[in-house]
Amino acid sequence: SGTTNTVAAYNLTWKSTNFKTILEWEPKPVNQVYTVQISTKSGDWKSKCFYTTDTECDLTDEIVKDVKQTYLARVFSYPAGNVESTGSAGEPLYENSPEFTPYLETNLGQPTIQSFEQVGTKVNVTVEDERTLVRRNNTFLSLRDVFGKDLIYTLYYWKSSSSGKKTAKTNTNEFLIDVDKGENYCFSVQAVIPSRTVNRKSTDSPVECMGQEKGEFREI
């Protein structure tokens, strides 16, 4: 059932990276507007993005309250200019989203190599600990704060003169690797949550190479 000349939203899709979470849907509205509601499985519905002509709604503020909860959203369709109008069953047309559990499903954003420092034949590579929109005690938590040891980083490193990529892993944000003296190396990192079955890996960080300004070399 529904209101004359309104169509139900479809293709409801969660787009989420490092917990920044947007619900998207179709179609682009023609003579209609949308309102979104979100709820946990056991909670009450909360309305967001009231009577919007957008086909997306930022739900970050709601999901960051508890990223381990499972959320459900629904998109209501109303005739433009007559938002009080309801369908024959007494309620506006709506469509449910798939369930979404941020902790398990948010995409890992592209990491950044913060710095690297060579001391003799060792190189320390540090990955930037990206800030998320998840809050605790009024401070924003980093990705490491949220995921703890569930988050690991894989470092790919290679001699500038060769193509084979060696790997190292860390469950902190730092790597200490052995390198050959007098060789320049390039680095790229990838964030991984090994316990996941989907959305396990980030895209690779931009490549950083020795001899560029991010690095520091110390001979001892």
Epitope: K149, I152, T154, Y156, S163, G164, K165, K166, T167, A168, K169, T170, N171, I177, D178, S188, Q190, V192, P194, T197, V198, R200, K201, T203, D204
Partner: antibody
Framework: EVQLVESGGGLVQPGGSLRLSCAAS????????IHWVRQAPGKGLEWVGY????????YYADPVKGRFTISADTSKNTAYLQMNSLRAEDTAVYYC?????????????WGQGTLVTVSS | DIQMTQSPSSLSASVGDRVTITCRAS??????VAWYQQKPGKAPKLLIY???FLYSGVPSRFSGSRSGTDFTLTISSLQPEDFATYYC?????????FGQGTKVEIK
């Protein structure tokens, strides 16, 4: 159910080529790293190389460097081991194995293996 | 490359015996060591990961421990199905390397 199935093994002459396949099911290879490991008759396990299908990065053991190439086709969810300039010492059962890229776990699933015999 | 020196290369034991296999890494590998069991004509199976953690579905008679760069696999009470070859592996750095294997045979 997670499964890895190797194929393509057989008898090949020294100097010849062979391409092995590792077909994965129950998971998406681009979410993992795929390794090749071999075992000569009556011998131990020897690591051959790996590919990260999400970025194409590879690395090879010294004995096969320049002769073997690992690739992946994510649309087919399959990894490959192209073996060129084969030698008698490459005779082995070749396994592919899944690496969850964990700080803790190494190779959690292995294929059943495919036998490559290099002989004239 | 990191060498994993495994010993003994073979041992004979009886059902119910306590069996210990050791592996020494040539340099620090943190806890990035796994143990595998392999039976003839079959692929290796993961037993122990991160030096001391039992992999899912593996009987509790298997255990692993670490002391510095020395790693130990222990079978507390050998069962008939445990006669096999066991390998250690470090995955701390590329290339990952295996020990030479220990064949556990029936006495």
């Amino acid at each position: 159910e997670v499964q890895l199935v190797e194929s393509g093994g057989g008898l090949v002459q020294p100097g010849g080529s062979l391409r092995l396949s590792c077909a994965a099911s129950g998971f998406t290879i681009s979410d993992y790293v795929i390794h090749w490991v071999r075992q000569a008759p009556g011998k131990g396990l020897e690591w051959v190389g790996y590919i990260d299908p999400s970025n194409g990065y590879t690395y090879y053991a010294d004995p096969v460097k320049g002769r073997f190439t690992i690739s992946a086709d994510t649309s087919k969810n399959t990894a490959y081991l192209q073996m060129n300039s084969l030698r008698a010492e490459d005779t082995a059962v070749y396994y592919c194995a899944r690496d969850p890229q964990s700080f803790y776990i190494a190779f959690d699933y292995w294929g059943q293996g495919t036998l490559v015999t290099v002989s004239s | 490359d990191i060498q994993m020196t495994q010993s003994p290369s073979s041992l004979s034991a009886s059902v119910g015996d306590r069996v210990t296999i050791t592996c020494r890494a040539s340099q620090d590998v943190n806890t990035a060591v796994a143990w595998y069991q392999q039976k003839p004509g079959k692929a290796p199976k993961l037993l122990i990961y991160s030096a001391s953690f039992l992999y899912s579905g593996v009987p509790s008679r298997f255990s692993g421990s670490r002391s510095g760069t020395d790693f130990t696999l222990t079978i507390s009470s050998l069962q008939p199905e445990d006669f096999a070859t066991y390998y250690c592996q470090q995955h701390y750095t590329t290339p990952p390397t295996f020990g030479q294997g220990t064949k556990v045979e029936i006495k």
